[in-house]
């Protein structure tokens, strides 16, 4: 009839479908993560350092709607904050759980190593509060089962970092049992029905008005989850559907009213021209930063625009606060059929050409990859672009349907997404061991948090890890110090990483040219997911996507503003 | 791994009715959306009706007035209600899992006299 506080907390992340947990063992976490082999179906990643557990823990979350990360006081909890960091930025629900000293060392203000020495035990839990939702410091048993709900809930519905402490004297107290019999309320509180009837009504006058609509899937209609929504407002209104760089994967690229990849001064021309000369533009999940919007060069010819957030609308100049995008939705989906019935469907921008035939012998370029690789692809896979390169040629390619994205184009921290492949393919094993994970990270970024390879190995996961080798950091080479030393980085030698952090059934390739590119792609045995494969893309110094080469102008015109 | 079930298809005659049910496992839907699809012979798979964690419910106008979908958590399961069936309603009847984009196997359901 009583479980301890330590047990109660994985049961309840069990209970919301977080399955595994990341993070490293500290002395003040030691006895709570004991209880995580009480629970059955739970289990204990254990990272290479915290920095990479938090880049998984966001990973998992943007393929399973939250995650956990375990870390100690201190210095393991200050690892993990740039990842965390990401993860407020970037909208992903992530609950870090920080074992921290006991009450009784806290009150005595002891001189506890892993302190600054000054008794101060609340600094570090102030430093994440800025990049938290929530916090809580439990000091009650009796009220911490409320507490873990309330940050369980927190990190789900708002899709932010949640900050929860557990000091190591508690997590072996009990608490009733009975309280796991009553879930956690996860749904959203519904919307205030004045406030949402002006929305929706508004919404459609604007619609039944429309000549030329679109609508434009943005970040955070994969991370708040209304992907299906979106999908279905394409199917009952047929307007062209266009994604930004942070919206790949939120809606089927190969629906016939799929239209390409907006960023504003970077698109397409004929992307360019059909979102610009929009008259309604119905933009799901906006996050306006600069990566994704070629530099805010949006220039909508139309004042008609619908933001919709998670919690807020915006219609032309006017927001209505609260009013959150997943009910507005829903209910539109009942009506805007009828509001849209006089829309004449026009044509939407023709898809990207395959890449014409070239001899096999021809040296692998970006741009012909990039193209090439929507060939390889499979419904459901999980596509991972490090920032740099990879994250702006993955524009290039279209996405078979059910494809999910993932990149870091707002926060951009280097390497992120080694932790976020580990984390991904956890996920993507607990919800189908065939879904393949797919990353794509330049020789430069790996060297950050190349270390996570060795917890993929560890736990039997097969991601794909397709090393661009362009010999340094090339994202900053266009952006500034083409020929400095700082962006040059000690060649490696990819193909020993794997035997080196101790695979047993792996395969490692070398692809240099489109033959090679050809040969390897399309091998049967190459597309099933049967082991951890690693695979070196040999590819000329400066080779960049055009729209890299584009962006780095930009950023490099306003780092230079006065 | 997460896996939906789909039961309850058939035989049955114009306007009689037909529950449907999906069963889940390797996962606590009680905060994931899930969809109920059909797909007739030679056409697309379509959507028939979704139910949100809060309860919310979908259907397209085929569907409105005659089929009730609803969810009981504490099965991990979801139900398809289908009233006044037509022969038009003949199809595969699949179940999916929205954020993960899961289907179950399908069950058949035929209308006719």
């Known amino acids: 009839s009583e479980i301890t506080l330590g047990k109660y907390l994985f049961e309840r992340l069990k209970q919301v479908n977080v399955n595994t947990v990341f993070g490293l063992p500290g002395d003040f976490n030691l006895s709570l993560l004991d209880k995580i082999y009480e629970v059955e179906g739970m289990r204990w990643a254990g990272n290479a350092n915290e920095l990479n557990a938090a880049y998984a823990a966001d990973g998992y979350a943007r393929i399973k709607g939250m995650s956990c990360i375990i870390t100690t006081f201190g210095v393991g909890e200050l690892s993990a904050l740039n990842g965390i960091a990401g993860s407020y930025a970037e909208h992903v629900g992530v609950l870090h759980v920080v074992g921290v000293p006991s009450i009784s060392a806290q009150a005595k203000q002891l001189l506890l190593h892993h302190t600054l020495g000054n008794g101060d035990f609340t600094v570090f839990h102030r430093m994440s509060a800025n990049i938290s939702e929530t916090t809580a410091m439990i000091t009650d048993i009796a009220t911490a089962p409320a507490e873990i709900d309330r940050c369980i809930r927190t990190t789900y519905v708002t899709q932010r970092p949640v900050y929860l402490g557990l000091p190591a004297n508690l997590v072996d107290l009990n608490v009733p049992a009975k309280l796991l019999q009553t879930p956690i309320d996860m749904s959203l509180k519904p919307n205030d029905a004045e406030s949402e009837k002006e929305v929706i009504d508004t919404i459609l006058a604007l619609v039944k008005d429309a000549k030329n609509p679109v609508i434009l899937a943005d970040a955070c209609c994969s991370r708040h989850d209304v992907k299906a929504e979106t999908k279905k407002l394409i199917d009952l209104t047929q307007f062209p559907a266009f994604v930004t760089p942070m919206g790949k994967g939120s809606i089927d690229e190969q629906h016939p009213r799929y239209g390409g990849v907006y960023v504003g001064t970077l698109s397409k021309p004929e992307v360019k021209e059909a979102v610009e000369s929009a008259d309604l533009i119905l933009s799901v999940g906006a996050l306006l930063s600069d990566f994704n919007t070629g530099s805010f060069s949006y220039s909508y010819k139309t004042k008609n625009i619908v933001e919709f957030h998670s919690d807020h609308m915006k219609i032309r100049n006017a927001t209505f606060p609260g009013v959150q995008m997943k009910f507005v939705l829903q209910k539109l989906l009942t009506t805007i059929a009828d509001a849209a019935k006089g829309y004449k469907p026009v044509a939407v921008p023709a898809r990207t050409p395959a890449n014409a035939a070239v001899p096999a012998s021809t040296p692998l370029k970006q741009e012909w990859m990039w193209n090439q690789l929507g060939n390889f692809l499979q419904e459901g896979d999980v596509v991972i672009a490090e920032t740099g390169t990879s994250a702006f040629g993955i524009n290039q390619t279209t996405f078979p349907n059910n494809t999910y994205g993932i990149s870091q184009v707002l926060w951009g921290s280097i390497g992120f997404t080694t932790g976020a492949t580990l984390g991904a393919a956890f996920a993507a094993e607990e919800i189908d061991p065939k879904k393949r994970v797919i990353l794509f990270i330049g020789d430069g970024s790996l060297q950050l948090t190349v270390q996570e390879i060795s917890t993929m190995i560890r736990w039997g996961l097969k991601p794909y890890l397709f090393v661009l080798n362009n010999d340094g950091y090339t994202i900053e080479k266009l952006i500034h110090g083409p020929k400095a030393q700082y962006n040059e980085i000690q060649g490696w030698d990819h193909l020993s990483l794997l035997p080196t952090f101790g695979a047993k059934d792996y395969e490692t390739h070398r692809v240099a040219t489109t033959g090679e590119w050809d040969k390897l792609t399309q091998d049967k045995s190459f597309n099933d997911n049967s082991k951890i494969r690693m695979i070196e893309i040999m590819l000329p110094v400066f080779d960049a996507p055009q729209n890299l080469v584009e962006q780095a102008k930009l950023t490099a015109a306003t780092n230079a503003k006065q | 791994q997460v896996q939906l079930v789909e039961s309850g298809g058939g035989l049955v005659q114009p306007g009689g009715s037909l529950r449907l049910s999906c069963a889940a496992s390797?996962?606590?839907?009680?905060?994931?959306?899930l969809g109920w699809y059909r797909q007739a012979p030679g056409k697309q798979r379509e959507l028939v009706a979704t139910?949100?964690?809060?309860?919310?419910?979908y259907y397209v106008d085929s569907a409105k007035g005659r089929f009730t979908v609803s969810r009981d958590n504490a099965k991990n399961t979801v139900y398809l209600q289908m009233n006044s069936l037509n022969s038009e309603d003949t199809a595969v009847y699949y179940c999916?899992?929205?954020?993960?984009?899961?289907w179950g196997q399908g069950t058949q359901v035929t209308v006719s006299s």
């Open positions: 999916k899992l929205e954020r993960y984009g899961v």
């Open positions: 390797g996962i606590s839907f009680s905060i994931n959306t």
């Open positions: 139910v949100t964690t809060g309860g919310s419910t």
